[in-house]
Structures are given as C-alpha cells and as structure tokens.
Amino acid sequence: TLNSVLNSNAIKNLPPPLGGAAGHPGSAVSAAPGILYPGGNKYQTIDNYQPYPCAEDEECGTDEYCASPTRGGDAGVQICLACRKRRKRCMRHAMCCPGNYCKNGICVSSDQNHFRGEIEETITESFGNDHSTLDGYSRRTTLSSKMYHTKGQEGSVCLRSSDCASGLCCARHFWSKICKPVLKEGQVCTKHRRKGSHGLEIFQRCYCGEGLSCRIQKDHHQASNSSRLHTCQRH
C-alpha cells in the first residue's frame, strides 16, 4: 500500500465498490480510521451516555454507527450504536470499530488487511489547523525496519505511522504521505466514515491523541450537514 511516500504508511487503493473504478488514481484514497493497533482498538473506550438520535454515521462518535436499535426496526428511529468488533457481522464499513472494516459481512482488521481507505473529507475543505492526513498505525512492522530505520520527523516521507517519531502519524499530503502531528484536544479532526460521493481527502489529518476521540462539536449538532465540525474531545 505504498501508493504514497517513503517512511512507511502509504495510502492504499480502496476496493472498487468504495473507491470508484480500480485503476484510476481516484481509487486511492486517504487512510484508515483511528489509531490502528495490531491487537484491536487499544484506545477505544465505552462512554456511558444516553442514546443519541442520528440520521447518519457522521453524527455519531468514532466508535459508533447510526442505525435502528432493533433489527428490522423503524428506519425513521435511529440512534448511535456501539461499533462492532472484529469477527462480528456487519453490513457496511461504518458499523465496524476503528481499525476494522466490513468484508463479506464480517468486521475484519484493517491492520491485517491493510485497508486504509477513507473518502470522508473533500479536497476543498479548509479548516484552520494544519491539514494533517491520517494513516493507519504501522501494521506488521518488521524487526529489521525497527532496528534500522530512524523515525521521521514532521514533514518526513513515510509509508506508515511506524516510520514517524512519537506524536506523529503518517498521513497523506496531496499524492504522497508525510509525518504529521497527532491531533490535540480541541483541534479539528476528520470523521472517517466512508461516503462514496465525497471527494478524495488529499490533506489527511492525523487521528486524535490518546484519551481523545473525534466527535461533533456540541454547538454544531443542529448545523447543516455541510458545516458540521468535529474536534478532538476527551472521552
């Protein structure tokens, strides 16, 4: 999946159903959601809160998806539900927890399958903070690469986040990937839900730092779809 830069976290081609025609540059999109860890979702926490009504996945937290609470329930009544872990049944990518995606009806680990696709942010989006890109956590980092490769500083070429120093992730910048800062509390983040109609995210942001999740700002709940703002917030 090195359609990207050198350090070691490139953007990969999205499977045709999500990313468009295979073979076209447009089929390669931004990176995977959240911090991807080989063993699952290391920083995932479960908040105790009232069910939040929603119309689409983007209105829910990183570890949630929007659906009817009962199977075959009224489609008009939807709430944010906890994401589904690895090996659980799914119908779409958004149902699976960060670090996983829906393949053949089952949530499988992006970590093992190198799925790093997102089509969330359009190329015209321009919020204030440095347009970091997100790339999945370095998966399958070999012993040799750990031993022999110095970690890249901000701006360094990378293929995966393990190529970057602590506090940085490997994220897309235009058509290659570079090390960018992991997002801090209050910084604008990108909700990584896949919506095929959106443009390529050529300025990926990193994921939110430890203890933070990318959630819609409270005062933006009533805003129109186009102006929803997500920021890194404490769990």
Epitope: T1, L2, N3, S4, V5, L6, N7, S8, A10, I11, K12, N13, A22, P25, S27, A28, N113, H114, R140, T141, T142, S145, H149, G152, Q153, E154, G155, S156, V157, C158, L159, R160, D163, H173, F174, W175, S176, K177, I178, C179
Partner: antibody, heavy 117, light 107 residues
C-alpha cells in the same frame, strides 16, 4: 505532460564530490515525493531514498544513509542527489522517480555515473 | 527489510503464448505490489500498481494477481515487443525493495 529530466552523464574520480539533478515539469512539484533509485550495471534496482518537497522531509535506505544527500530546490522544481566523496562502487545508473500514492509512476531517463581512477 | 524473491531469472516465450513471472515476499505485504517493465537503455515503466491495478495506457494483456506473500505477473498473449526485464516492487514498508528481475525473451 509530466517530465523528469536528469542531468548528463558524469565521469569522476574516487574521492571527488558530485551532484546530479532531476528537473521536473508538468505537475506541481511540491505535491509528490521524489525518489532516487540506483541500478548498478547488469543489476536490479535499489531504492536509495526520497524527499517530500513540501517541507523537505527525507527518508533514506539505511544502505545509503550518510553517503548520499537528497535535496530539492522548490523554486526550480528540481531534486538533487549528491555525494561528498565518491567511491568506485558508486558507479551506476541513477534514476529519479516521482511518487504517486506509493508507486513510482514517472521516471527520469537516468544519469550514468562513472567512477574510475 | 522485506526481501522479494523473483522467478524465473529468465524465460523465453513464443508470441501468442502466456508468460508468468512470480514474486514472493519475505513478509505479508497485503496487495502492495507493483510491477515494472524495463527495456534496454530505458528507465523502468510502471505497468501495475498496488491492488493489482493496471496503469492507464498499459495493454490489458498485462495482469497481476496475488496478495499477502505470493504475487504473479501474467502477460497473455505475449508480443514481440514485450522483450524486457520485469521487476516487482513492494511499497508496503520502508525501505522500498525490488525483486532481482526477470528477463523475458520472445522466441
């Protein structure tokens, strides 16, 4: 049309310095990482390293780190590969190659470097 | 570093026949494999990029398959101007590494 035009062949002696160039056109130079690849006579290709012109960040193959330096001049959309002290074993064909989402899609025509005493 | 073992080192195929080149990686790289063609005196040309994606302008005679550690480049049918060296390149993990190359000759 994307083009990568490399500097002419060089004949050098061991211990001499050298800088070869790769002038690009037809695309926005700062939007793609530039790689350098070595091909010794009759041998396979070896990735030496790359640079992202946006902030000048580099990554090197450990095999070449410390022996070569990769740089760019954004004003002229040119990438450089340089040696401060050449060795006989540096004799090879050197290619610059543009990164496109991980793959090296456009290549320069190559610069042949001969190092002989 | 990820080691790419390419085979055969050389092969000769008659026009109209099928040529198959394999590349085995020392570790799982998902589908982050690229294939290049290099003719004498020329730089490599990208044929197929990650995800077994045929590059624009490359004839459909070229195809690739594989994921994980085993990858195959197939040329079917082979034509006279396919004489060249073919290389695999993994773009999964730094440093990028290439296979040793396969020399394809047309009988």
């Amino acid at each position: 049309e994307v083009q990568l035009l490399q500097s002419a062949a060089e004949v050098k002696r061991p211990g001499e310095s050298l800088r070869i160039s790769c002038k690009t056109s037809g695309y926005s130079f700062t939007e793609n990482t530039m790689h350098w690849v070595r091909q010794m006579p009759g041998k396979e290709l070896e990735w030496m390293g790359g640079i992202n012109p946006h902030k000048g960040g580099t990554s090197y193959n450990q095999k070449f780190k410390g022996h070569v330096t990769i740089s760019v001049d954004k004003s002229s959309s040119t990438a450089y590969l340089q040696w401060s002290s050449l060795k006989a074993s540096d004799a090879a064909m050197y290619y610059c190659a543009r990164d496109w989402l991980g793959a090296m899609d456009y290549w320069g025509q190559g610069t042949l470097v001969t190092v002989s005493s | 570093d990820i080691v790419l073992t390419q085979s055969p080192a050389s092969l000769a195929v008659s026009p109209g026949q099928r040529a198959t080149i394999t590349c085995i990686t020392s570790t799982d790289i998902d589908d982050d494999m690229n294939w290049y063609q290099q003719k004498p005196g020329q730089p490599p040309k990208l044929l197929i990029s990650e995800g077994n994606t045929l590059r624009p302008g490359v004839p459909a005679r070229f195809s690739s398959s594989g994921s994980g550690t085993d990858f195959t480049l197939t040329i079917n049918p082979v034509e006279a101007n396919d004489t060249a060296n073919y290389y695999c390149l993994q773009s999964d993990n730094l440093p990028y590494t290439f296979g040793q190359g396969t020399k394809l000759e047309i009988k």
